[in-house]
């Protein structure tokens, strides 16, 4: 009778196996700032150091009373999840605990700093194997918590912060806000996400997957022995952090980047209800729900890329939005999304030597995204070649002139402020493969990528009659790099890719007027890495 | 997120000069002042001051210090709780929210966060 | 050879008292814990309370609270049950084990039989 | 409180054949249960730990398994000595001890 989150986690071919580091030992080892924990529960005995860091404020009230398995309560019970002998994720990691959070589950962020330096400097007296940090608290939107974590990540550290339990954007809180963390929202037994009384679990674009965040049996400091269940997005990033671990521990080498990737690409897609979330939260809320991926020894050499959503630009008539990705990341294409449609463009720049997307608002617009498309491609070399806008009624084509590039997505950018005068872009697929075409006072930006054995196709569907959105998707074996919608209605809200799935959005006012000849087409772009292979344009 | 969200920061007004002490009107305030939005999560009177990120380690000492000594000259006195090395430059400290023009004008200062709570979740 | 002998068993008015012992040897008594359980004729096992073996604290099922009182003279490595106000009900083998909390009741002595009549 | 129910109450077999005792929790306890043998005039005695680890002593044909809420003990071919009653027990925090009802294992 295994507990549901662990059969829904860690799919069945994985239930009996043990991971181990190729040496044979188990060397990831597991931070976690919390509360107090009971080290001598038999889930985690002889498994967990309990440090003596301790750095907490004063709990609140004269008559509060410290007892001990309360204290200890929300931090065993975490420890329990990420490796508990029984209940555990991870069974075999061993875990480390710091002290950020008080008998009332109140910490600081100036504590959570302190802790966070403390893990720096331990790596800095006696470098060991893996570190993964587990961060199962939040407090409001903290430039230097984010900031810290970044550094943190970048001397190699794994950090999987909860989303928050405040039924919130994510982003309006830290660290689950900061970029190089893995933030993680709760689902329920039902993949449904998670209602705690009259809050529940974050969501928006901050949020890179959910995982078991719902009546979920862990360790209890009631006694050694004792379970019981505890519910939020701590015991969800809980999950993701022993997936981390165990991730770590079969292949010690996987950068931030990788784990990031590979957890998204073999989490369980479009199980959750989206209804659930505020509705201009769910086109960025990641419908994604965690599972322990296999090795890259059994999957090869998969292309696998990610969507990443600015924040919202704000209404301003120049207002820009910019979305970037991951450092080890490559941008391979950059979208646009506006709720009104009132959009002028995207494009893709360097800024201090990373190329980021960015996207433009257009005159009466309330605010648009920059969708960027994050992918691993080993050994890649991509840039970026753009026309600037033709004269009046010409097409300007871009395509990748250098050897063995292929394109992997393109960008359209308008000059003019006036919506109705210009037609939308497009990718031609057949007339001239390989390029990017755009229409009137549209700059047309292609990226072209060189890669081992990487090769790309556009593929594009069409729909005539009204519709909200035209959807195409990459088969089986494919990759979506680029997602763009090309002429049809006069107003389209823009593009975004949704896992392998290109979505082409159209305004709701734009069904009424559209002829049926008006086709509005969602080309992808949709790309494969075949290391024996050299790269390629598939017609 | 890149961008800062529901949150505050402020850019104090300050004075081109304070008490004509010369060596402080030469340094212009340019770091900011950010706190959590959330006022019931607020901790006033703890702040976390955060140095430009080439900041060596000699020098983030000075800093505080240096916030010391000129705070002991209006008549305050504050405490460094903790210095920052190993994550980012900076130092944490317990002061009167009075003294926050006078440390944005410190030289190294990127900006000054004052502390807030965080929540097991 | 860990060793547990109760003693102290026998036949008690309804209302009276009696304390048993339990003398341990075979090992560091100090450092052990102990616990007493005990069977009614023909019924299942019932745990009465323990006594920590690193502050010499005790605890107790909610049945026993007021009735039983568990304690130790480590330099005599003998283990005591104080039982008070005894009833027809109280009639049972009492046994004394070591355990190890969190784990398992791994030495039990032969058990004392105690009888509460008139 | 956590409760333990055993079944069957009484099992009625002959030296030799199979005899499988099951322990139900009320609630998740992991593999933190044991068994324990208790021969008529007799103590108790730990047979075993953590749900499938025999004690010191214990003849390889008893077996135990389970986790979660479910266990089980198998005495795989049943010798005379084997007719017994067989407690399960688990910790919990109040009380700490807790028995099954236990289950007689009686020559047919």
């Known amino acids: 009778s295994i507990p549901w989150n662990l059969e829904r986690i860690i799919p069945a071919w994985h239930q009996t196996e043990e991971d181990r580091s190729p040496d044979g030992s188990s060397q990831v080892e597991v931070y976690l700032l919390d509360t107090s924990i009971q080290g001598a529960h038999r889930e985690i005995e002889g498994r967990v150091t309990i440090t003596d860091f301790n750095s907490v404020p004063e709990e609140d009230g004269t008559r509060f009373h410290r007892q001990a398995s309360k204290c200890d309560s929300h931090g065993t019970h975490l420890a329990g999840v990420v490796s508990g002998r029984d209940a555990g994720v991870a069974k075999g990691t061993s875990l480390h605990s710091l002290r950020v959070l008080n008998c009332q589950g109140k910490g600081t962020v100036s504590g959570t700093l302190i802790g966070l330096e403390f893990i720096r400097k331990s790596q800095l007296i006696q470098p060991s194997g893996p570190l993964v940090v587990l961060l199962p608290l939040a407090g409001g939107y903290s430039r230097i918590l984010n900031a810290a974590c970044r550094h943190l990540a970048r001397t190699g550290v794994v950090l999987v912060a909860a989303a928050g339990n405040f039924r919130d954007d994510a982003c309006l809180y830290s660290p689950a806000s900061a970029p190089e963390v893995i933030t993680v929202g709760a689902t329920n037994a039902q993949d449904q996400p998670v209602t705690l009384g009259t809050l529940g679990t974050n969501f928006g674009r901050c949020v890179d997957l959910f995982a078991p965040g719902k009546d979920i049996i862990g360790a209890s400091s009631d006694c050694s022995t004792c379970f019981m269940s505890q519910s939020g997005t701590s015991q969800a990033a809980a999950h993701v952090a022993g997936i981390v671990a165990r991730m770590l521990s079969r292949e010690p080498t996987l950068t931030l980047a990788e784990l990031r990737q590979r957890l998204i690409h073999f989490s369980t897609k479009d199980v959750i209800n989206m209804a659930w979330f505020p509705e201009d939260q769910q086109v960025l809320t990641p419908n994604l729900v965690a599972t322990l991926p296999p090795s890259t020894h059994e999957t090869g050499g998969q292309l696998l890329c990610r969507t990443v959503w600015s924040a919202h630009s704000g209404p301003t008539r120049t207002a820009t939005a910019t979305a970037r990705c991951a450092p080890e990341e490559e941008l391979l294409s950059c979208s646009s999304f506006s709720r009104s449609g009132r959009r002028r463009g995207d494009w893709i720049e360097a800024i201090g030597g990373q190329q980021v997307c960015k996207a433009l608002n257009a005159f009466g617009g309330e605010g648009v995204y920059a969708v960027a498309r994050c992918c691993l491609v080993p050994r890649a070399n991509c840039s970026i070649h753009n026309t600037p806008a033709a004269r009046a009624g010409l097409e300007t084509h871009v395509h990748c002139h250098q050897k063995d590039h292929v394109l992997t997505g393109c960008s359209f950018h308008w000059e003019v402020e006036d919506l109705s005068v210009r037609r939308q872009p497009a990718l031609r697929s057949r007339r001239q493969p390989g390029q990017c075409v755009g229409h009137q006072a549209a700059s047309v930006y292609a990226s072209c990528c060189h890669a081992p054995g990487l090769e790309c196709k556009i593929k594009e569907h069409g729909i005539s009659g009204p519709s909200e959105q035209v959807t195409v998707a990459c088969e089986a074996g494919w990759t979506l790099t680029g997602c763009n919608v090309l002429p049809g209605a006069s107003l389209t809200l823009g593009a975004y890719s949704v896992d392998n799935l290109c979505v082409a959005r159209v305004h709701d006012t734009a069904r009424a007027d559209r002829t049926s000849g008006e086709a509005t087409v969602a080309a992808a772009i949709c790309c494969r890495s075949r290391p024996s292979a050299k790269a390629s344009w598939v017609q | 997120q890149d961008e800062d969200g529901d949150y505050e920061e402020l850019m104090l007004a300050l004075p081109s000069q304070e008490d004509g002490l010369a060596d402080e009107a030469a340094h212009v305030a340019t770091a900011t002042f950010r706190r959590c939005s959330k006022e019931a999560w607020r901790l006033p009177g703890t702040y976390i001051v955060v140095l430009m990120e080439e900041t060596q380690r000699l020098q983030i000492e000075q800093t505080a210090h240096r916030l010391q000594t000129r705070a002991a000259r209006r008549g305050y006195v504050i405490k460094v709780l903790h210095i920052f090395y190993d994550l980012f430059p900076g130092f944490l400290v317990k002061m009167s929210s009075d003294l926050l023009g006078l440390a944005l004008k410190l030289p190294h200062v990127e900006y000054i966060e004052e502390d807030s709570f965080v929540f097991a979740q | 050879q860990v060793q547990l002998l109760e003693s102290g068993g026998g036949l008690v008015q309804p209302g009276g008292s009696l304390r048993l012992s339990c003398k341990a040897s075979?090992?560091?008594?100090?450092?052990?814990?102990f616990t007493w359980v005990r069977q009614a004729p023909g019924k299942g096992l019932e745990w009465i309370g323990w006594i920590d073996p690193g502050n010499g604290g005790t605890r107790y099922n909610e049945k026993f609270k007021g009735k039983a009182t568990i304690s130790r003279d480590n330099s005599k490595n003998t283990l005591y049950l104080q039982m008070n106000s005894l009833r027809a009900e109280d009639t049972a083998v009492y046994y004394c084990?070591?355990?190890?909390?969190?784990?398992?009741?791994?030495?039990w002595g032969q058990g004392t039989l105690v009888t509460v009549s008139s | 409180e956590i409760v333990l129910t055993q079944s069957p109450a009484t099992l009625s077999l002959s030296p030799g054949e199979r005899a499988t005792i099951t322990c139900r929790a009320s609630q998740y306890v992991g593999s933190y249960l044991n068994w324990y043998q208790q021969k008529p005039g007799q103590a108790p005695r730990l047979l075993i730990y953590?749900?499938?680890n025999r004690a010191t002593g214990i003849p390889a044909r008893f077996s135990g398994s389970g986790s979660g809420t479910d266990f089980t003990l198998t005495i795989s071919s049943l010798e005379p000595e084997d007719f017994a009653v067989y407690y399960c027990?688990?910790?919990?925090?109040?009380?700490?001890?807790?028995f099954g009802g236990g289950t007689k294992v009686e020559i047919k």
């Open positions: 075979g090992y560091t008594f100090s450092r052990q814990g």
């Open positions: 027990q688990v910790w919990d925090s109040s009380p700490p001890v807790v």
């Open positions: 953590d749900a499938s």
């Open positions: 084990a070591r355990y190890r909390v969190g784990y398992s009741l791994d030495y």
